[in-house]
């Protein structure tokens, strides 16, 4: 109840001189607090900026290709706890991009030892039409890549509730959510706990029995009556995502070699690629079986390396 606001009448008293002295002291205190507040706000802003910058440094955006999955078998759970969650894990390895500059080429051999041999010889004379071109073979300096496991758990006991209206105090809203989600008429069931966050207007409802969450999730919305107004809150599966075995790796490619020194060539890239391929196929040139050649004579190209 509103701190007895309606229960007691406030009596106004005449001010004594002592009270005015107190007022002056209070005014000074308020000014001091206000200054401190401004100072703290500035500090918070500064720290928030630093935090944002730090966060950006540790963010990785990767376009992960779509993967086709093969369904192998049905597992018979040993106990009920295995039924309370659906879990799956994905191994994610990022491809490492490398920019091939103008006048450069990348050549990938089938065997590592061939690549190593080409690099150790360093200088190679390649016949390109009527020009005998000296190219330099170097290891490919790669940026770091990442490898990690994404572990996803979809709960069969919990649900997420969003778009909860901010119409009640926190304790009352918790009660109201539990009450509403326990109604079997709407597919609900006995509620174990409610974790409600008023600020975000969301909650996590944990049920006592398996299967209740599934029933509720058959619909995307759920009715919540507050003072005769029916609010429709949004329900969605509760998932927990963990990042595991996060590894950052770097190094040089074992089968791919960087060729430089072709800046002056004005020819079709595909023709040059064929000529490089022919040259490095020959054992007498220190080469061997070639997998692929990618050449850049105009615009730089991006090549992606994977494990």
């Amino acid at each position: 109840m509103e701190a007895d606001k309606d229960d007691t009448q406030q009596i106004l008293k005449e001010h004594s001189p002592d009270e005015f002295i107190k007022d002056e002291q209070n005014k000074g205190l308020i000014d001091e607090i206000t200054k401190k507040n401004i100072q703290l706000k500035k500090e918070i802003q500064k720290l928030e900026t630093e935090l944002q910058e730090a966060t950006k440094e540790f963010q990785i955006k990767e376009d992960i290709p779509e993967t086709k999955m093969k369904f192998l078998s049905v597992e018979t759970p040993e106990n009920d706890s295995q039924l309370s969650n659906i879990s799956c894990s994905f191994q994610v390895s990022s491809k490492v991009p490398y920019e091939i500059q103008k006048g450069q080429a990348l050549i990938t051999f089938e065997k590592e030892e061939v690549a190593q041999n080409v690099v150790s010889m360093s200088k190679h004379h390649v016949q390109i039409k009527d020009v005998n071109l000296e190219v330099t073979a170097k290891p490919v300096p790669l940026n770091s890549g990442v490898r990690f496991q994404v572990y996803v758990e979809v709960s069969k006991m919990k649900i997420n509730v969003t778009e909860i209206p901010d119409t009640l105090r926190e304790d009352q809203m918790r009660d109201k959510l539990e009450l509403s989600f326990s109604k079997s008429r709407n597919g609900g069931g006995e509620v174990d706990r409610v974790d409600y966050d008023r600020q975000s207007g969301s909650a996590v409802i944990t049920f006592v029995e398996i299967g209740v969450a599934d029933k509720i999730l058959k619909k995307k919305e759920y009715p919540l009556y507050i003072n005769q107004t029916c609010h429709r809150v949004t329900v969605s599966p509760y998932t927990e995502i963990h990042l595991k075995k996060y590894q950052i790796f770097s190094g040089t490619s074992k089968r791919t070699v960087l060729l430089t020194g072709m800046e002056g060539i004005q020819m079709d890239e595909e023709i040059v690629e064929d000529l490089i391929n022919i040259h490095f196929q020959r054992a007498k040139n220190g080469g061997g079986e070639v997998d692929v050649v990618k050449c850049s004579l105009g615009q730089p190209h991006i090549a992606y390396f994977e494990e």
Epitope: M1, R169, D171, Q172, E178, L179, S180, R193, V194
Partner: antibody, heavy 124, light 112 residues
Framework: QSLEESGGDLVKPGASLTLTCTAS?????????MCWVRQAPGKGLEWIAC????????TYYASWAKGRFTISKTSSTTVTLQMTSLTAADTATYFC?????????????????WGPGTLVTVSS | ALVMTQTPSSVSAAVGGTVTINCQAS??????LAWYQQKPGQPPKLLIY???NLESGVPSRFKGSGSGTEYTLTISDLECDDAATYYC??????????????FGGGTEVVVK
């Protein structure tokens, strides 16, 4: 389904007393608030406090009862009311009541189950 | 605080007659109003919830109506057994205060 209050007694002013409400035929669930209501001799009904019977166990008090009265859920079938610094004005029959949610299509409530009451007399 | 004001404090009517009891809330209670009947030495009995919904087992002679802050209980075809004290009550969820609960002062119905 029934409720029964116990613990009513004749006590001196300033004393403390704990009343217990025991439910039979049902156990507390998310659809109820368990409450205490009192009635002074020859007077009307006066709400004291409620506790949510669901998992949160939220408590709500009448403004005059805050600080002196404490409602608690001690099991899935019992609720207590602790009263301190009792005065003659607290002399009354104390009822335990179940406030039920009729919220099939609205936010409706009603005390649909009452105990017979227990008498508390504060006198020197 | 939620305050329920009930009028009149006492009313008398003959058997077969009709009585009307009024209840005014200090704020909008969104039809979340209940009516109770109490006989001496007994606990109250719920008659109506949600302003107009009859609790099971309660005769249809009891009729509740109203909205917002004004509510009415009408008892028609009065019977001797209807002699009792009647109370209105409401509980209200709130965004700024505790969940409040309040009873009206009661109306004594005398059947002649």
């Amino acid at each position: 389904q029934s409720l029964e209050e116990s613990g009513g007694d004749l006590v001196k002013p300033g004393a403390s007393l704990t009343l217990t409400c025991t439910a039979s035929g049902f156990s507390f669930s998310s659809s109820y608030y368990m409450c205490w209501v009192r009635q002074a001799p020859g007077k009307g009904l006066e709400w004291i406090a409620c506790i949510y019977a669901g998992s949160s166990g939220s408590t709500y008090y009448a403004s005059w009862a805050k600080g002196r009265f404490t409602i608690s859920k001690t099991s899935s079938t019992t609720v207590t009311l602790q009263m301190t610094s009792l005065t003659a004005a607290d002399t009354a029959t104390y009822f335990c009541a179940r406030e039920y949610s009729y919220d099939d299509y609205g936010d409706f409530w009603g005390f649909n189950l009452w105990g017979p009451g227990t008498l508390v007399t504060v006198s020197s | 605080a939620l305050v329920m004001t009930q009028t009149p404090s006492s009313v008398s009517a003959a058997v077969g007659g009709t009585v009307t009891i009024n209840c005014q809330a200090s704020q909008n209670i969104y039809t979340n109003l209940a009516w109770y009947q109490q006989k001496p030495g007994q606990p109250p009995k719920l008659l109506i919830y949600g302003a107009s919904n009859l609790e099971s087992g309660v005769p249809s002679r009891f009729k509740g109506s109203g909205s917002g802050t004004e509510y009415t209980l009408t008892i028609s075809d009065l019977e001797c057994d209807d002699a009792a004290t009647y109370y209105c009550q409401s509980s209200l969820y709130s965004r700024i205060a505790d969940r409040a609960n309040a009873f009206g002062g009661g109306t004594e119905v005398v059947v002649k």
